[in-house]
């Protein structure tokens, strides 16, 4: 064998350890990535792992906070199943008193009679809370209301169906003051103003009456 | 002083619609009832229609319910009728008129406003 | 449609005294108050009494109004040739819900 073929030999093997070098490499290279990939998705899941655990550990103390408090609102029934509700059917509850807005359209005295016969009063407002109230609770509607405020002419005070006299600083009623008629000077409101006229004509009413807050 | 001046009067055939203005003034516009009244060629006084101070009460004549419209504008100081289907028993002078009350006296009238309805 | 009735015409010498009727029903003169009017010749309406009795600043005391059950009357005293116009009457029916007016009565100063 001449050296030149020796030299040839080598050469070639060389190549081939090289070829199989780079290959070994490519294979730890990948395995390595591989490694790390499985790493990296490892971490991954254990965070998710963790962040689930907390979730749940969250939710498992809102429900145990839900059903205290369910606790809490049946023992609140079972109290309030004793009691009778603070006002009737239909009618609206707002502080003291229950209100009910009328769905017929009456002079005063015939509005007078109707809250009457419900075991109330028309309309009386003893606060700028009331007024408010009220205001707000026909903001809706254009129409008037009879309040239980009256007088027979206008060198009479304004008096409410009690006998009490209006509170000046309430509000000041508008409107027909400076008239006297056979039937009376009544007091409407609507849109939030109060307004003087012949309590003959028909409108709607507000009559009110007292909640009941006690237990029985 | 207090004064009431109508426009929008003038001649519309039948079924045909005009819309009357009443300008106020020298007064709180909104502490009154306002009214039409108007008048035949010749004849007497006929009340039209009312409105309360903020509109809550109105009331027609049965002559115009259904055809007239009543209102008012507080920022303008304005009363209006809206007049429509009109027909030849409708010529009149109308007056618009102020009230301390929906159900008293007039106690301010205007001069009126000619409305002829004629083919 | 005239709820409140009126005498169509009346008539008085200078000097003398005349009254013109309104006669109306339960439902207006009998539960609200009457007002007079009177206009003039080609002029609107001016009102002469209100609150069945009450005459408003600047209107002669000579005019003078009342009211009884379901009728009411204005008198005229001292008859002025001025005084010669149409006076209405007017009031609320409650029933009907609206003002009525007197079909109007024309007063001549002979």
């Known amino acids: 064998m001449q050296l030149s073929q020796v030299s040839d030999l080598l050469t070639q093997e060389q190549a081939n350890l090289t070829h199989q070098k780079k290959k070994l490499e490519g294979q730890i290279s990948a395995r390595q990535q591989a490694e790390e990939a499985s790493q990296e998705s490892e971490n991954e899941l254990k965070e998710m792992i963790e962040t689930l655990a907390r979730k749940l550990n969250e939710k498992s103390k809102e429900q145990m906070e839900l059903h205290h408090q369910n606790l809490n609102l049946q023992e609140t029934l079972k109290r309030v199943a004793n009691c009778s509700a603070p006002c009737p059917q239909d009618w609206i509850w707002h502080g003291e008193n229950c209100y009910l807005f009328s769905s017929g359209s009456f002079n005063w005295e015939k509005s007078q009679e109707k809250c009457l016969s419900l075991d109330a009063k028309l309309l009386k407002i003893n606060s700028t809370a009331d007024l408010d109230f009220i205001q707000q609770a026909i903001s809706y509607s254009s129409f008037p209301f009879w309040m239980g405020l009256s007088r027979r002419n206008p060198s009479y005070p304004w008096l409410w169906e009690d006998g009490s006299p209006l509170m000046p600083h309430l509000f000041r009623v508008r409107g027909a003051v400076s008239q006297t008629y056979p039937s009376g000077t009544c007091a409407y409101i609507q849109r939030g103003a109060v307004y003087a006229e012949n309590c003959i004509l028909a409108a709607f009413s507000i009559c009110q009456k007292k909640a009941n807050l006690r237990a029985q | 002083q207090v004064q009431l001046l109508e426009s929008g009067g003038g001649l519309v055939q039948p079924g045909g619609s005009l819309r009357l203005s009443c300008a106020a003034s020298g007064f709180t516009f909104s502490d009154y009832a306002l009214h039409w009244v108007r008048q035949a060629p010749g004849k007497g006084l006929e009340w039209v229609s009312v409105?309360?101070?903020?509109?809550?009460?109105?009331y027609y004549a049965d002559s115009v319910k259904g055809r007239f419209t009543i209102s008012r504008d507080n920022s303008k100081n304005t009363l209006y009728l809206q007049m429509n289907s009109l027909r030849a028993e409708d010529t009149a002078v109308y007056y618009c008129?102020?009230?301390?009350?929906?159900?008293?006296?007039?106690?301010?009238w205007g001069q009126g406003t000619l409305v002829t309805v004629s083919s | 449609d005239i709820v409140l009735t009126q005498p169509p015409s009346v008539s008085g010498a200078p000097g003398q005294r005349v009254t013109i009727s309104c006669s109306g029903s339960?439902?207006?003169?009998?539960?609200?108050?009457v007002s007079w009017y009177q206009q003039l010749p080609g002029t609107a309406p001016k009102l002469l009494i209100h609150?069945?009795?009450h005459r408003p600043s600047g209107v002669p005391d000579r005019f003078s109004g009342s009211k009884s059950g379901t009728s009411a009357s204005l008198a005229i005293t001292g008859l002025q040739a001025e005084d010669e116009a149409d006076y209405y009457c007017?009031?609320?029916?409650?029933?009907?819900?609206?003002?009525?007016f007197g079909g109007g009565t024309k007063l001549t100063v002979l």
């Open positions: 609150s069945n009795s």
């Open positions: 409105i309360s101070y903020q509109g809550g009460f109105i």
């Open positions: 339960s439902s207006n003169i009998g539960s609200n108050y």
């Open positions: 007017q009031s609320w029916d409650y029933e009907s819900e609206r003002v009525v």
């Open positions: 008129a102020r009230s301390p009350g929906l159900t008293s006296y007039h106690d301010s």
